[in-house]
Interface confidence: low
């Protein structure tokens, strides 16, 4: 019992959560509270928005991102992707790993013009030590944070 | 081997289902099915709508609401909120972990006002033993419950 | 330490990805690749579509489908439904596990004809050594398939 | 019923600014965004940008990036539109105009500004 | 130049149809509004959407598209609706609205 406890606290696991700073507009990936709240580290390492793995092996990843807007904003794409990539030593381009399409824009009403969608991914993905997961959100100004509850990011080994 | 397994099996995990019961109506959580069909508990008990923890840890925590309805009626906000949220002894309110709010209305179309959407919500947080989570929607009258298979909330020890 | 890392090592999981032949059109369920790119099987086996249980226990079990359109096709259903189903040798019909019914069609827009949209299912089931998972989508006409990564299959015990 | 109620005609000077309010009278412009339209004298409508007052977003087109900046404010129900660096090509006739958005429809239209360039 | 190419000048014979076009690639993703505008008065929307009418728009008028083309349809035109008839849409990147040059249109009789 001991051995499975053990087994149970050294299995590695995070969730990171949206903040304030997570849009950057730079064109890069989401970045994301790590320590506060409900975010937490185990096991795995974080580095400018990237979840960086020490242990390799097949890891469970996830991520959901809240979406907002009035109508379909002039300057954005109709179509929004959310997805998480992987960045490999091995190769000078990110992979995509698990991506969704979505036109969130449609879910205005004629009577409201004021919109919600959330887009959530998770799959079973194998990852090497050293390898990084990053969120990418296109276009990242329909992403609504608030508090970590309605956009985050995370995984755990399987 | 026999370690391996073991430690399968004492895995907490739980799969809760939706049934005609689920809504109340009075403003609580929705109440779930335990046992019949596909529903189960092992290593986490139930209390009131609540998964109820027995074994401190991290548990990645889900849940999915079906959502349906004919236009957007009035009297119902535009905006759907489906969450799950922790109650603690340690702190009077319950505590948002994960949120997502849509704006399902939108979906129906100009031939056919009749809409279905779907929210789903997973990730993993840090649960200690006595601590409980709940799902909520607001509101609740847009939930559409059949067999069990379209609205269902769970957990399984990461 | 040995005997955790076995542990993980022989935990049952797969992760299988959309492919050109994934639709058949032919009624039944959604094929999948099994073996290139992100997909692989571990301590599971696959057949016409289906996750074949060679470990009976507590699985967690997954899908996406990438779901896409222009405006809502005549003799199309306005309404989609995505489902992850068990054959059982002890029963002679498919039994219904996780779906979700969404009406995408009403994410075009008045200003675009062009939608896209995406259903994840996940959660727990228990599942006996022979028994099998397949995932459905009526009508699978909308399934928009690219490269493995925006509609998948998957599963692992927990 | 909701207007939209515009400020007064201006002369300018060429290199001056110009800014333009909008005000929804009987209403706010909460669930809407509103865009800005201007019309040459003799010439067609074209669309300057627009703003979504509720998420203070703004947006412009290309022609104008840089030369124009839309604001909003909530509390007023009023929105603004400024152009810098006028010319005399700037001669025109400016409408706020209720977008309802996902429509790209304007709805409702402000009676115009007329703003006059000229040294 | 416009995205959005219309006729210039149209006429119509009092109580028949005329149909205006407006072409773009853009309309291929997108549909396309409608607009009328009299002499000194602002532009009045008259066709959104598929085919929506704000309230107060006679159901003379309709709207329809097919490819890369939008067309306002007049049944049964009548005197008051001689004005100016503008379209718009996205452009082709879908980040910003374009309109068409506009169609004089003359009611004749």
């Known amino acids: 019992l001991i051995q499975e406890r053990r087994s149970h606290e050294v299995n590695p696991a995070a969730h990171l959560t949206g903040a304030n700073s997570s849009l950057t507009g730079s064109g890069g990936p989401l970045l994301w509270e790590t320590q506060l709240g409900l975010a937490f580290l185990r096991g795995l390492s974080y580095h400018d928005g990237a979840l960086v793995v020490t242990k390799a092996g097949y890891y469970y990843i996830y991520s959901k991102v809240q979406l907002g807007g009035v109508g379909c904003p002039l300057g954005l794409a109709s179509t929004i992707t959310h997805g998480l990539y992987k960045r490999t030593p091995r190769y000078p381009e990110e992979l995509e790993l698990l991506v969704s399409q979505q036109s969130p824009c449609g879910r205005a009403t004629s009577s409201s013009r004021v919109w919600w969608d959330s887009s959530f991914l998770g799959g079973v993905v194998h990852l090497e030590a050293g390898e990084e997961v990053v969120v990418r959100v296109l276009d990242e100004r329909l992403v609504r944070l608030r508090d970590g509850t309605r956009s985050y990011f995370g995984a755990f080994m399987v | 081997l026999i370690q391996e397994r073991r430690s399968h099996e004492v895995n907490p995990a739980a799969h809760l289902t939706g049934a005609n019961s689920s809504l109340t109506g009075s403003g609580g959580p929705l109440l779930w099915e335990t046992q019949l069909g596909l529903a189960f508990l092992r290593g986490l008990s139930y209390h009131d709508g609540a998964l109820v923890v027995t074994k401190a840890g991290y548990y990645y925590i889900y849940s999915k609401v079906q959502l349906g309805g004919v236009g957007c009626p009035l009297g119902l906000a535009s905006t759907i909120t489906h969450g799950l949220y922790k109650r603690t002894p340690r702190y009077p309110e319950e505590l948002e972990l994960l949120v997502s709010q849509q704006s399902p209305c939108g979906r129906a179309t100009s031939s056919s006002r009749v809409w279905w959407d779907s929210s789903f919500l997973g990730g993993v947080v840090h649960l200690e033993a006595g601590e409980e989570v709940v799902v909520r929607v607001l509101d609740e009258r847009l939930v559409r419950l059949r067999d069990g298979t379209r609205s269902y909330f769970g957990a399984f020890m990461v | 330490l040995i005997q955790e890392r076995r542990s993980h090592e022989v935990n049952p999981a797969a992760h299988l990805t959309g492919a050109n032949s994934s639709l058949t059109g032919s009624g039944g369920p959604l094929l999948w690749e099994t073996q290139l790119g992100l997909a692989f099987l571990r301590g599971l086996s696959y057949h016409d579509g289906a996750l074949v249980v060679t470990k009976a226990g507590y699985y967690y079990i997954y899908s996406k489908v990438q779901l896409g359109g222009v405006g809502c096709p005549l003799g199309l259903a306005s309404t989609i439904t995505h489902g992850l189903y068990k054959r059982t040798p002890r029963y002679p019909e498919e039994l219904e596990l996780l779906v979700s019914q969404q009406s995408p069609c009403g994410r075009a827009t008045s200003s675009s004809r062009v939608w896209w949209d995406s259903s994840f299912l996940g959660g727990v089931v228990h599942l006996e050594a022979g028994e099998e998972v397949v995932v459905r989508v009526l009508d699978e006409r909308l399934v928009r398939l690219r490269d493995g990564t925006r509609s998948y299959f998957g599963a692992f015990m927990v | 019923e909701v207007q939209l109620v515009q400020s007064g005609a201006e002369v300018k000077k060429p290199g001056s600014s110009v800014k333009v309010s909008c005000k929804a009278s009987?209403?706010?412009?909460?669930?809407?965004?509103v865009s800005w339209v201007r019309q040459a004298p003799g010439q067609g409508l074209e669309w300057l940008g627009g703003i979504l007052p509720i998420f203070d977003t703004s947006y412009y087109a290309q022609k104008f990036q840089g030369r124009v900046t839309i604001t909003a404010d909530e509390s007023t129900g009023t929105a603004y539109m400024e152009l810098s660096g006028l010319r005399s090509e700037d001669t025109a006739v400016y409408y706020c105009?209720?977008?309802?958005?996902?429509?790209?429809?304007?709805?409702?239209w402000g009676r115009g500004t007329m703003v006059t360039v000229s040294s | 130049s416009s995205e959005l190419t219309q006729d210039p000048a149209v006429s119509v014979a009092l109580g028949q149809t005329v149909r205006i076009t407006c072409q773009g690639d853009s309309l291929r993703s997108y549909y396309a509004s409608w607009y009328q505008q009299k002499p000194g008065q602002a532009p009045v929307l008259v066709i959104y959407g598929k085919n929506n009418r704000p309230s107060g728009i006679p159901d003379r008028f309709s709207g329809s598209s097919s490819g890369n083309t939008a067309s306002l349809t007049i049944t049964g035109a009548q005197a008051e609706d001689e004005a100016d008839y503008y379209c718009n849409s996205r452009d082709s990147s879908g980040n910003h609205v374009v309109f068409g040059g506009g169609t004089k249109l003359t009611v004749l009789g």
């Open positions: 009987g209403g706010t412009f909460s669930n809407y965004a």
């Open positions: 105009a209720r977008d309802q958005g996902f429509e790209d429809a304007f709805d409702l």
